[in-house]
């Protein structure tokens, strides 16, 4: 696995332990918490990053209305089970034997159950809607400039193929970034939209996962863009399975659909 040879660190993941014990004395980096060897030339999977995090000390509307099946990560942090490739296992359980099914970004997509709960397959999240509100700025942002800058960011910083950035919408002060990636579209070596979205989420919270880099400096024609709040919606290839109780009321939501729970990252 590639890593910075000179000082043996992982440029794309600071939550690693690296040492020159790879083949031929090459630098090899392992994710904290799991000990899984990671490829430092690309993004580390969200599952391994969450595991590492848990192991560490502690007018015409152009905006998209999230689909009724959109999920938002309301459950917060948990210590996930990852498969050998670093993907989330379809079923996750906590220490008290409460289990639930998750999608490919690790967000719960069923009611919680017991150890008898079955999750037949890991359902792919194929559409991610990143909803941001930016801080008021001295200079206005031009939509096409903003679009170009965000596409550049996902291409250069997160190494996400441009074809997976489906759209950038802007209605001041709200920015929406749509990422789409079907199972059939994702080739070997392609960064997963879920991983790119997670790196972006951590960046805009001022918690960059990249080694030794300062905070993300995002500019549109030189004007800094500061993010006041972030909300991420996840859409799966197969709609989630929640009980009617959750859908008809009793949710902690902020919208007409109670599984759009608003998770404020800022």
């Amino acid at each position: 696995h590639t890593a910075a040879q000179d000082n043996c660190t992982c440029p794309t993941n600071k939550m690693t332990v690296c040492s020159p014990d790879g083949p031929g004395g090459r630098c090899q980096c392992r994710a904290l918490g799991s000990g899984v060897a990671v490829d430092c030339s690309t993004l580390t999977s969200k599952c391994l990053l969450l595991k590492a995090r848990m192991s560490a000390p502690k007018n015409a509307r152009t905006l998209v209305r999230p689909n009724e099946h959109a999920l938002v990560d309301n459950d917060g942090l948990y210590d996930p089970d990852c498969d050998p490739e670093g993907r989330f296992k379809a079923r996750q359980c906590n220490q008290t034997s409460v289990c639930w099914c998750v999608n490919s970004v690790g967000v719960r997509r069923t009611d919680k159950g017991d150890l008898s709960l079955r999750c037949d397959e890991l359902v792919r999240t194929h559409h991610i809607l990143i909803d941001l509100r930016h801080r008021p700025t001295a200079g206005a942002f031009n939509h096409s400039d903003l679009d170009a800058e965000l596409r550049r960011l996902f291409r250069e910083r997160y190494r996400l193929h441009p074809k997976f950035v489906a759209a950038v919408h802007y209605e001041q002060p709200t920015i929406q970034i749509e990422l789409r990636q079907n199972t059939s579209q994702k080739a070997a070596g392609d960064v997963d939209i879920g991983d790119a979205a997670y790196y972006f989420e951590r960046d805009v919270k001022g918690e960059s996962l990249f080694q030794g880099r300062g905070g993300l400096d995002l500019r549109v024609r030189g004007e800094p863009l500061q993010v006041e709040r972030t909300l991420i919606y996840y859409l799966d290839e197969i709609p989630p399975k929640f009980s009617m109780k959750r859908l008809t009321g009793g949710g902690s939501g902020g919208g007409s659909h109670h599984h759009h729970h608003h998770h404020h990252h800022h």
Partner: antibody, heavy 122, light 106 residues
């Protein structure tokens, strides 16, 4: 440490131009904009504009538009501010200052250069 | 343009006393920045985003406020704090500074 070093004092005649330099060190030069602020004798601080070295974007105070030009030389990590058609009221100390910003915050103007006194006199 | 008015123009206090400097904006701003300037020196950033202490600035300095009214407080004046203080807004162009408050020894 982050440092901005400006060129020395200048004496100019009315109608002439002056070009002040600001050499940056101690940080990634292209990652922050450089602002220019002046202080006339006995007056407050007056913002003139900024230039962003990564792509050359700039924003000028309308008051100085047409008279001020900011340029950058990334090879030497130096920013220049040229003020033309000088008049006596342009006599001031001119400062360059770095504005560091991330998606989380705007960290203000820090640090500032030591200042360059420009005297306009016939 | 947004006009920032600082008051008082001059504040005469003794070391150890508390200093309260005001900055009033002609229209609402989201954040205010505070700078200190001593004779013959360049300004120095004290506070960014209204209330955050800049690197290396002592904890006796603090900032607060919202909308049009902002305050810089020095809890207990040290001899090196006697200087001119400026507020600045980054809400709209042109960026503007207040005219300054001079904190002098009584």
């Amino acid at each position: 440490q982050v440092q901005l070093v400006q060129s020395g004092a200048e004496v100019k005649k009315p109608g002439a131009s002056v070009k002040v330099s600001c050499k940056a060190s101690g940080y990634t030069f292209t990652s922050s904009d450089i602002n220019w602020v002046r202080q006339r004798p006995g007056q407050g601080l007056e913002w003139m504009g900024w230039i962003y070295p990564r792509d050359g974007s700039k924003k000028y105070n309308e008051k100085f538009k047409g008279r001020v030009t900011m340029t950058v030389d990334t090879s030497t990590s130096t920013v220049y501010m040229e003020l033309s058609s000088l008049r006596s009221e342009d006599t001031a100390v001119y400062y360059c200052a770095r504005r560091f910003a991330t998606v989380v915050s705007n960290y203000g103007l820090d640090p500032w250069g030591q200042g360059t006194l420009v005297t306009v006199s016939s | 343009e947004i006009v920032l008015t600082q008051s008082p123009a001059t504040l005469s206090l003794s070391p150890g006393e508390r200093a309260t400097l005001s900055c009033s904006a002609s229209s609402s701003v989201n954040y205010i920045y505070w700078y200190q300037r001593k004779p013959g020196q360049a300004p120095r950033l004290l506070i960014y985003d209204t209330s955050n202490l800049a690197s290396g600035i002592p904890a006796r300095f603090s900032g607060s406020g919202s909308g049009t009214d902002y305050t810089l407080t020095i809890s207990s004046l040290e001899p090196e704090d006697f200087a001119v203080y400026y507020c600045q807004q980054w809400n709209s162009y042109p960026l503007t500074f207040g005219q300054g408050t001079k904190v002098e020894i009584k």
